[in-house]
């Protein structure tokens, strides 16, 4: 542990309130394939606590979806991995639209700090599957 | 190699008969630029040879595809990539459809165990291009 | 560093002019959140600087996209990375098309040698977004 | 605690307006979204759509368009529900509801208020 | 617009018994189905959420389960104080939309 090999990997746990686009995560041996090791959560956000670069990856697939649900919704249905905290850290990571798609998926390396709170906002009125092969959301420390 | 660092990168060497869905790999540099590094074959699926975390990742091209021949047929095309064996340790890890695309790709970690053998599962009537720069599937050790 | 972390992020500086379809890449702390360490940039192409097998990711979204405009195009945009120099070396490692999507993101495993140098040819004639979470391209170093 | 909490009931008559209204209390009235539910005598539960309190922005199912508007007064933590040109088929019962954690699902529902149009 | 069905419309049945209201979807809704129960001249009280999650103080003798397009609410010994109509209601995707409800009843 000592080499700083921090890792997670998390499944769905469920959706915010209308007002809160962040999706809720959740992570442990007893619910499947997902875990955490060294990053934790904090009320279904995932925060790190090693200073390093990481891999950040995630899939998200849409629950009710074909190609024309997801062109017809006036407001677009997209996913945004960001830092929300600590607020002066606060940026975007990572974002897709699902245009007309009902998956997306990505990974990018990006430097993250302790006590960095990743967040994983999806705006649209689609709800995502929460199969745990078909929404999953990680990060691997790779380097100091 | 003590440290474990087990990896592996294919490229596509057939489709299986109608009734099985499964696509059968090969890997080597002699084959271009897939190998294998401590995985191994064994008739065209990836079996694992260390325990540990490790980060699968896929992409699939599917050979003659327009926006449409995905969205025409009536069941879709999807793309699954799971533990076939030990009939145990069956489960689907990682799911995605090809909706109005023609190229899935997507990445995750997950714990995987030694005589693991992954199967990537390619259902509906397309057939996935062979172009190595198209479709390739591979998996890396990451730790323990 | 002597344990070969080379490791890069980068984020698009430009397109080139009309006949040339390269996209042209900035790394720095200074430019936000991407950086250089190890690899490096040759006119805005990165160039490898220790032998071994590399993780490449990439993430291309196009600046004024629909659904429509991606399908619309007779000829398809298309994003491949290949190592493009040395000449002898030259092949093509990871392609997609844009279908009926406005973003591309995959990632592969590839055998690297110092003095390749990686180019990322978007051809159609639709531009990509500068957002540095919407277009991004890295590599990360895995083992000798 | 929570509370939503509903204005009376009115009778009115054909082509006249009725406004509705539900003051929430116990919580931070900006941070979860007000939803409306019409329930007809004797019949079903109708999602009629809803208002986003921090933005003001509404959204309204199909058949709740025109004639229904969803708004806000921010600083007595209230949603209003106004319907103009009323018909008959507009007596139901009015709902206001709110999510607590989980996105679509009503943990608080107000009262409910009895709108009866009748000439 | 995704519709629910839910039967049955009303039904019969003594205290002690066990109860089983059915629901399907239109289309899968992936277990974003939730329950109400609605007493006559109130509001909708929410009693599982996620097609099997109890919602909090609610008794263990309601349950809920399926998947796909098919949903089950149970109730595993009728009490007096159930008698009431129970709603369903999908949370997938907007409009939501709810059943037309079922009218439960003692024998």
């Known amino acids: 542990e000592s080499l700083g090999w921090d890792i997670a990997e998390l499944q769905l746990n469920h959706t915010g309130p209308q007002q809160d686009p962040r999706l809720y995560w959740q992570g442990g041996p007893a619910l499947g394939r997902s875990f955490l090791r060294g990053p934790e959560l904090d009320k279904g956000q995932l925060r790190i606590r090693r200073d390093g670069i990481y891999m950040v990856h995630i899939q998200v697939t849409l629950a009710i979806c074909s190609s024309t649900s997801t062109s017809r919704h006036h407001h677009p249905t997209t996913l945004a991995v960001g830092i929300c905290s600590p607020a002066s850290r606060s940026i975007s990571l990572l974002r897709l639209s699902f245009h007309q798609g009902c998956t997306i998926a990505s990974q990018r390396l990006t430097p993250l700090a302790r006590g960095d709170t990743l967040c994983t906002n999806l705006t649209g009125t689609l709800l995502p599957s929460r199969n745990t092969d078909e929404t999953f959301f990680g990060v691997q420390w790779v380097r100091p | 190699e003590s440290l474990g660092w087990d990896i592996a990168e294919l490229q596509l060497n057939h489709t299986g008969p109608q009734q099985d869905p499964r696509l059968y790999w090969q890997g080597g540099p002699a084959l271009g630029r897939s190998f294998l590094r401590g995985p191994e074959l064994d008739k065209g699926q990836l079996r694992i040879r260390r325990d540990g975390i490790y980060m699968v990742h896929i992409q699939v091209t599917l050979a003659i595809c327009s926006s449409t021949s995905t969205s025409r047929h009536h069941h879709p095309t999807t793309l699954a990539v799971g533990i076939c064996s030990p009939a145990s340790r069956s489960i689907s890890l990682l799911r995605l459809s090809f909706h109005q695309g023609c190229t899935i790709a997507s990445q995750r970690l997950t714990p995987l165990a030694r005589g693991d053998t992954l199967c990537t599962n390619l259902t509906g009537t397309l057939l996935p291009s062979r172009n190595t720069d198209e479709t390739f599937f591979g998996v890396q050790w990451v730790r323990p | 560093e002597s344990l070969g972390w080379d490791i890069a992020e980068l984020q698009l500086n430009h397109t080139g002019p009309q006949q040339d379809p390269r996209l042209y890449w900035q790394g720095g702390p200074a430019l936000g959140r991407s950086f250089l360490r190890g690899p490096e940039l040759d006119k805005g192409q990165l160039r490898i600087r220790r032998d071994g097998i590399y993780m490449v990711h990439i993430q291309v979204t196009l600046a004024i996209c629909s659904s429509t405009s991606t399908s619309r195009h007779h000829h398809p945009t298309t994003l491949a990375v290949g190592i493009c120099s040395p000449a002898s070396r030259s092949i093509s490692l990871l392609r997609l098309s844009f279908h009926q999507g406005c973003t591309i993101a995959s990632q592969r495993l590839t055998p690297l040698a110092r003095g390749d140098t990686l180019c990322t040819n978007l051809t159609g004639t639709l531009l990509p977004s500068r957002n540095t979470d919407e277009t991004f391209f890295g590599v990360q170093w895995v083992r000798p | 605690q929570i509370q939503l909490v509903q204005s009376g009931s009115e009778l009115k008559k054909p082509g006249a307006s009725v406004k509705v209204s539900c003051k929430a209390s116990?919580?931070?009235?900006?941070?979860?979204?007000m939803n409306w539910v019409r329930q007809a005598p004797g019949q079903g539960l109708e999602w009629m759509g809803w208002?986003?309190?921090?933005?003001?922005?509404?959204t309204y199912a199909d058949g709740f368009t025109g004639r229904f508007v969803f708004s806000l007064d921010t600083s007595a933590s209230t949603a209003y529900l106004q319907i103009s040109s009323l018909k008959a088929e507009d007596t139901a019962v009015y709902f206001c509801?709110?999510?607590?954690?989980?996105?679509?699902?009503?943990?608080?529902w107000g009262q409910g208020t009895l709108v009866t149009v009748s000439s | 617009d995704i519709q629910m069905t839910q039967s049955p419309s009303s039904l019969s049945a003594s205290v002690g018994d066990r109860v089983t209201i059915t629901c399907q979807a239109s289309?899968?809704?992936?277990?974003?189905l939730n329950w109400y129960q609605q007493k006559p001249g109130k509001a909708p009280k929410l009693l599982i959420y996620?097609?099997?999650r109890l919602h909090a103080g609610v008794p263990s003798r309601f349950s809920g389960s399926g998947s796909g397009t098919d949903y089950t609410f149970t109730i595993s010994s009728l009490q007096p104080e159930d008698i009431a109509t129970y709603f369903c209601?999908?949370?997938?995707?907007?409009?939501?939309?709810f059943g037309q409800g079922t009218k439960l009843e003692i024998k």
């Open positions: 509801a709110r999510e607590e954690d989980y996105r679509y699902v009503f943990n608080y």
């Open positions: 116990g919580y931070t009235f900006t941070n979860y979204g």
């Open positions: 208002i986003n309190t921090y933005t003001g922005e509404p």
């Open positions: 289309q899968d809704i992936s277990n974003y």
């Open positions: 996620d097609t099997s």
């Open positions: 209601q999908q949370g997938v995707t907007l409009p939501l939309t």
